[in-house]
Amino acid sequence: DAEFRHDSGYEVHHQKLVFFAEDVGSNKGAIIGLMVGGVVIA
């Protein structure tokens, strides 16, 4: 998990989240997303 401090004086936490593709479809493999401030953005 990476943590970045910004000039605004608060910290934004970045966390990689990994999901299995077959949980949401028929593909195999992993889906990697990025959660920033509690919201998955990718």
């Epitope: 990689k16 989240l17 949980d23």
Partner: nanobody
Framework: EVQLLESGGGLVQPGGSLRLSCAAS????????MGWFRQAPGKGREFVAA????????YYADSVKGRFTISRDNAKNTVYLQMNSLRPEDTAIYYC?????????????????WGQGTLVTVSS
């Protein structure tokens, strides 16, 4: 929820191998993605590897990629972690966990069932 019981830990020399097993009780085993985490003395519990419900998909932490292999046998309700080329830094208690489908498999909070852990010590 499933009950989990790990086995297979022990003392091994650097470069050696171990195979951990995690036996699950309950008819819902194949509803869960299964993962292995580990916790070294004085450190937090960290993700090691996970396998999908079908066993088709796997994912590994960078620190174990190419050395560890996770697999599952849904007929036996068991998950395995084959650990090769072991290093002293692999020393930890290894925990098996069950994560319901659709949850992130690399974070501890996704797992609602845990075993009691099995100790792996890599030392000469």
């Amino acid at each position: 929820e499933v009950q989990l019981l790990e086995s297979g830990g022990g003392l091994v020399q650097p470069g050696g191998s171990l195979r951990l097993s995690c036996a699950a009780s309950g008819r819902t085993f194949n509803n869960y993605n299964m993962g292995w985490f580990r916790q070294a003395p004085g450190k937090g519990r960290e993700f090691v590897a996970a396998v999908s419900r079908s066993g088709v998909s796997t994912y590994y932490a960078d620190s174990v990629k190419g050395r560890f292999t996770i697999s599952r046998d849904n007929a036996k309700n068991t998950v395995y972690l084959q650990m090769n080329s072991l290093r002293p830094e692999d020393t930890a208690i290894y925990y098996c966990g069950a994560a319901y489908r659709g949850t992130a498999i690399n974070v501890r909070r996704s797992y609602d069932s845990w075993g009691q852990g099995t100790l792996v010590t890599v030392s000469s």
